[in-house]
């Protein structure tokens, strides 16, 4: 079944964590429907973004952050694993120094801390895609 | 009550038609939430695009038009007469020589035909909305 | 082993221009940002400027904002630093650094001294 | 004026605790790392992401940060631990600031 988009969760994050994304876009890649990910470091969708993880299917994909409600310098890629019409699975996992992004499996992009991963707060996924998983898996320590 | 989006509805316009939308950003204008209509020549989402209408909400919007499966010479606005947070109603009415487009009442652009109003055969209203008024009116002969 | 070696130091005049160097090797010089923090004498470090590891992006601290010009080439394994329109407050030992994955100054170069006087 | 604020001078006796301070950043955004100066030489890096050691830095070396505030503490201060100690973080991500810095004499 279908989870609400925009879809919101409060989380925890650290050295360790996963956040795994399962959907589908709503639109042909020819139409450029996006897909976001915003991790926030409060529940109120205005508050600053850790890591802001933004595809533009079939394009390209951009990641940055958002300080004291600025953003900051963007990382573009034209990498694009990401199937017209298809399914994909992200995974976002933290490691000590970056956010590594794969994309069905494969790892497809990083993005170096900013701001620690500790900060976050909440995630949101949202934009032109149907979500069916959504799980943040912890380290068990 | 909501109507599902992407919204897609078959329409066949000409001179005297409008089409008019109601509905709601899904996000504040920080996170800049997107509104999309575009009037199509086929029922298909992959068809050309006779206006290409596109609100980045406080920041833009882009008008366009999609001939042969290309983007050709995009026009921009920083008009801006949407408000973070509020319902609007938009209106595309079919004049002559262009369509015209009042926001909550308030002519704010215009776009010059390229392709025939009659070529279009369906509409398509999507992106970071919910929608509550989907309608085209046509003149009486 | 990180080797970081600045060049190009000197005496110049108040209002003058000097272009200091830093050769790289023991690393994948274009895998890494790099930056300039300079230290002048008997004072604290600053950061001066950084660069990304393609050198598109540049930043820039707000006290040689629209003066000084980082600049990299990957192919020769060199950081580069244009200082314009100097000031006797630029004057300072300037060091080479490898920024390391949290955005911290991994290695050091020896330094080399600017000193901007009439 | 830095926006990092460090004791100017602090002094330890041979083998024991030395906590350097460092106030007025925004560390439960920004990692902090600190840097150890001897006279005549360039920095050395001992602490990088609030608490991680890189290699070749002693154990006795650690660091924390809480709120306000991050420490670098020397369990143990040895008499070749005498020297400048800079803390650095940030103002935002792409602007890098360090603290005035902190003169540690081992006694």
């Known amino acids: 079944s279908l989870l609400p988009v925009p879809y919101t969760e409060a989380a925890s994050l650290s050295t360790g964590s996963t956040v795994t994304i399962k959907g589908r876009p709503l639109a042909c890649f020819l139409n450029e429907p996006y897909l976001q990910v915003d991790f926030h470091t409060e529940m109120k969708e205005e508050s600053d973004i850790v890591f802001h993880f933004q595809v533009c299917f079939g394009r390209r994909v951009v990641m940055n952050s958002r300080e004291y409600g600025a953003w900051k310098q963007q990382v573009e890629s034209k990498n694009m694993p990401f199937q017209d019409g298809q399914e994909f699975e992200l995974s976002i996992s933290v490691l000590p120094d970056k956010y590594q992004v794969m994309v069905n499996g494969q790892s497809s992009y990083t993005f170096d801390h900013r701001i620690k991963p500790e900060a976050v707060k909440m995630v949101q996924v949202w934009r032109d895609i149907s979500l069916t998983k959504f799980n943040v898996s912890y380290l068990k320590r | 009550s909501l109507l599902p989006v992407p919204y897609t509805e078959a329409a066949s316009l000409s001179t005297g038609s409008t089409v008019t939308i109601k509905g709601r950003p899904l996000a504040c204008f920080l996170n800049e939430p997107y509104l999309q209509v575009d009037f199509h020549t086929e029922m298909k989402e992959e068809s050309d695009i006779v206006f290409h209408f596109q609100v980045c909400f406080g920041r833009r919007v882009v008008m366009n038009s999609r001939e042969y499966g290309a983007w050709k010479q995009q026009v921009e606005s920083k008009n801006m007469p949407f408000q973070d947070g509020q319902e609007f109603e938009l209106s595309i009415s079919v004049l002559p020589d262009k369509y015209q487009v009042m926001v909550n009442g308030q002519s704010s652009y215009t776009f010059d035909h390229r392709i025939k109003p009659e070529a279009v055969k369906m509409v398509q209203v999507w992106r970071d909305i919910s929608l509550t008024k989907f309608n085209v009116s046509y003149l009486k002969r | 082993q990180v080797q970081l070696v600045e060049s190009g130091g000197g005496l110049v005049q108040p209002g003058g221009s000097l272009r200091v160097s830093c050769a790289a090797s023991g690393f994948t010089f274009s895998s890494y940002y790099m930056s300039w923090v300079r230290q002048a004498p008997g004072k604290g470090l600053e950061w001066v400027s950084a660069?990304?590891?393609?050198?598109?992006?540049?930043y820039y601290a707000d006290s040689v904002k629209g003066r000084f010009t980082i600049s990299r080439d990957n192919a020769k394994n060199t950081l580069y630093l244009q200082m314009n329109s100097l000031k006797s407050e630029d004057t300072a030992v300037y060091y080479c650094?490898?920024?390391?994955?949290?955005?911290?100054?991994?290695?050091w170069g020896q330094g080399t001294q600017v000193t901007v006087s009439s | 004026s830095s926006a990092l604020t460090q004791p100017s001078a602090i002094s330890v006796s041979l083998g024991q605790t030395a906590r350097i301070t460092c106030q007025g950043g925004?560390?439960?955004?920004?990692?902090v790392s600190w840097y150890q100066q001897k006279p005549g030489q360039a920095p050395v890096q001992v602490i990088y992401?609030?608490?991680n050691r890189p290699s070749g830095i002693p154990e006795r070396f650690s660091g924390s940060s809480s709120g306000g505030t991050a420490t670098l503490t020397i369990s143990g201060a040895q008499a070749e631990d005498e020297a400048d100690y800079y803390c650095l973080s940030y103002e935002s991500s792409d602007y890098p600031v360090f603290g005035g810095g902190t003169h540690l004499t081992v006694l």
């Open positions: 660069i990304n590891s393609g050198g598109g992006s540049t």
């Open positions: 650094v490898q920024n390391g994955g949290i955005w911290s100054f991994g290695s």
């Open positions: 992401g609030d608490s």
């Open positions: 925004n560390f439960g955004y920004y990692y």
